[in-house]
């Protein structure tokens, strides 16, 4: 049998015309039923009964998942991060071949030197993080190695990350043109050969909240769109109130379909009220218009 | 666990003469780099005298001609000998050593150090 939804109706309006009971549990279309036990409900838009109630997908809610909710969760990560594959060549360090086990003691020695190096290089920069070598090779040593870069996610991180990556190809280019041999011998930390920089890679995280809220939104990926507050992007639908893209529906009720946000007006005891945003009454009484 | 043990270090009259010897344990001289820093009062730390195991040496300007620098490997030993000694002489004298070959005068570049020796030169 079919479940007995309690549903309490006010009389709205659709600013198309039509009357319309809220919330809109269609009592008069047949639904699927899904039975569990003596239960059953009527859980639309893929949504299950799990003994209780209905358990709604995304972008739904509500007895039956028959309404579509305002805003969505949208979780940026905390941080985002960026992975610059670099190669400087180290002259002040002969080549052997020890160097190319990660476990040798040579290994250990030659990182934590190249480690502090680079920590000294890059120190002016808040989103370092650090070095990682890869690979080192003869030459004397070609360190080929990912400098890290995180920053706290605001709309504006790949700028961040962006204007960073350039800080650090201009802080490797100065340090490998300026601690070089002399006859032989090196007085900084590390000696590099000049020419040995390059940049081979960025990597760059992505994170697109627009691209997040469309997926989320599915069939009404149209409809919603992403504002920020306080550098936080929230998903929301026109019938979200408090945002620049909110609707006021004035004397009457933010529903969305598929065809977007609609106004469902109000019928009060001694008014009517119309038009797209709700907003022209009309005194059952007099027939006056309020404007 | 790397260790260096440094000794003959003590008080000369200037023109004198002194051998410092540095003992190690934990790797072999076949191997990487050797040599000896000082450090004089108020003053940073200074290369002296570097070895790498492929031949490479470095004498400090104030010091070729004078101090020569040179290894045992059948007793793990480096050795600093200190001719015709300098007032400017006096300082510690340290013994440092790295697993990698090494070009540099940086102390900061040498990872494995002694506890130091001191030499003073006075009349």
């Known amino acids: 049998p079919l479940a007995t939804i309690p549903v309490s109706t006010t009389s709205l309006t659709s600013s198309e015309g039509s009357t319309i009971s809220t919330p809109s549990v269609d009592i008069s279309t047949p639904v699927t039923t899904s039975i569990v036990g003596d239960q059953c409900s009527r859980c639309k838009n893929g949504g299950f009964w799990d003994g209780l109630k209905c358990q709604c997908l995304t972008p739904y809610y509500g007895e039956s998942c028959e309404e579509v909710v305002n805003s969505i969760d949208i979780a940026p990560p905390e941080t985002v991060s960026a992975q610059m594959e670099l190669t400087v060549t180290v002259t002040s360090v002969k080549f052997t071949d020890e160097l190319k086990n990660h476990s040798s003691q040579e290994f250990r020695e030659f990182n934590k030197t190249f480690t502090e190096q680079m920590n000294i290089v890059y120190s002016g920069i808040p989103e370092y993080v650090g070095v990682n070598i890869t690979n080192l090779r003869l030459g004397s040593v070609v360190v080929e190695h990912d400098v890290l870069l995180r920053t706290k996610y605001t709309p504006e991180y790949k700028t961040a990350l962006d204007n960073a990556t350039e800080v650090v190809k201009q802080k490797i280019t100065k340090v490998t043109t300026e601690q070089i041999m002399t006859n032989d011998n090196c007085s900084a930390l590390m000696c590099f050969n000049t020419t040995g920089t390059q940049v081979q890679n960025i990597t760059v995280t992505q994170y697109d909240p627009v691209e997040e809220c469309r997926q989320k939104a599915e069939e009404y990926e149209d409809y919603f769109l992403v504002e920020y507050r306080d550098q936080k992007p929230y998903c929301i639908s026109p019938c979200e109130s408090g945002f620049n893209a909110s609707k006021n529906c004035n004397h009457g009720k933010c529903q969305m379909s598929q065809n977007g946000a609609r106004c469902l007006c109000v019928t009060t005891e001694t008014h009517w009220y119309s038009g797209e945003d709700c907003n022209q009454g009309t005194q059952k009484s007099h027939h006056h218009h309020h404007h | 666990e790397v260790q260096l043990v440094e000794s003959g270090g003590g008080v000369v009259q200037p023109g004198g003469s002194l051998r410092l010897s540095c003992a190690a344990s934990?790797?072999?001289?076949?191997?990487?780099?050797w040599g000896w820093f000082r450090q004089a009062p108020g003053k940073e730390r200074e290369a002296v005298a570097l070895?790498?195991?492929?031949?490479?040496?470095f004498y400090a300007d104030s010091v070729k001609g004078r101090f020569t620098i040179s290894q045992d490997n059948s007793k793990n030993t480096l050795y600093l000998q200190m001719n015709s000694l300098r007032a400017e002489d006096t300082a510690v004298y340290y013994c440092?050593?790295?697993?990698?070959?090494?070009?540099?005068?940086?102390?900061?570049?040498?990872?494995?150090w002694g506890q130091g020796t001191m030499v003073t030169v006075s009349s």
């Open positions: 934990g790797f072999t001289f076949s191997r990487g780099s």
């Open positions: 070895i790498s195991s492929d031949g490479w040496t």
């Open positions: 440092a050593a790295s697993v990698l070959v090494l070009r540099t005068l940086n102390p900061k570049a040498w990872h494995h």
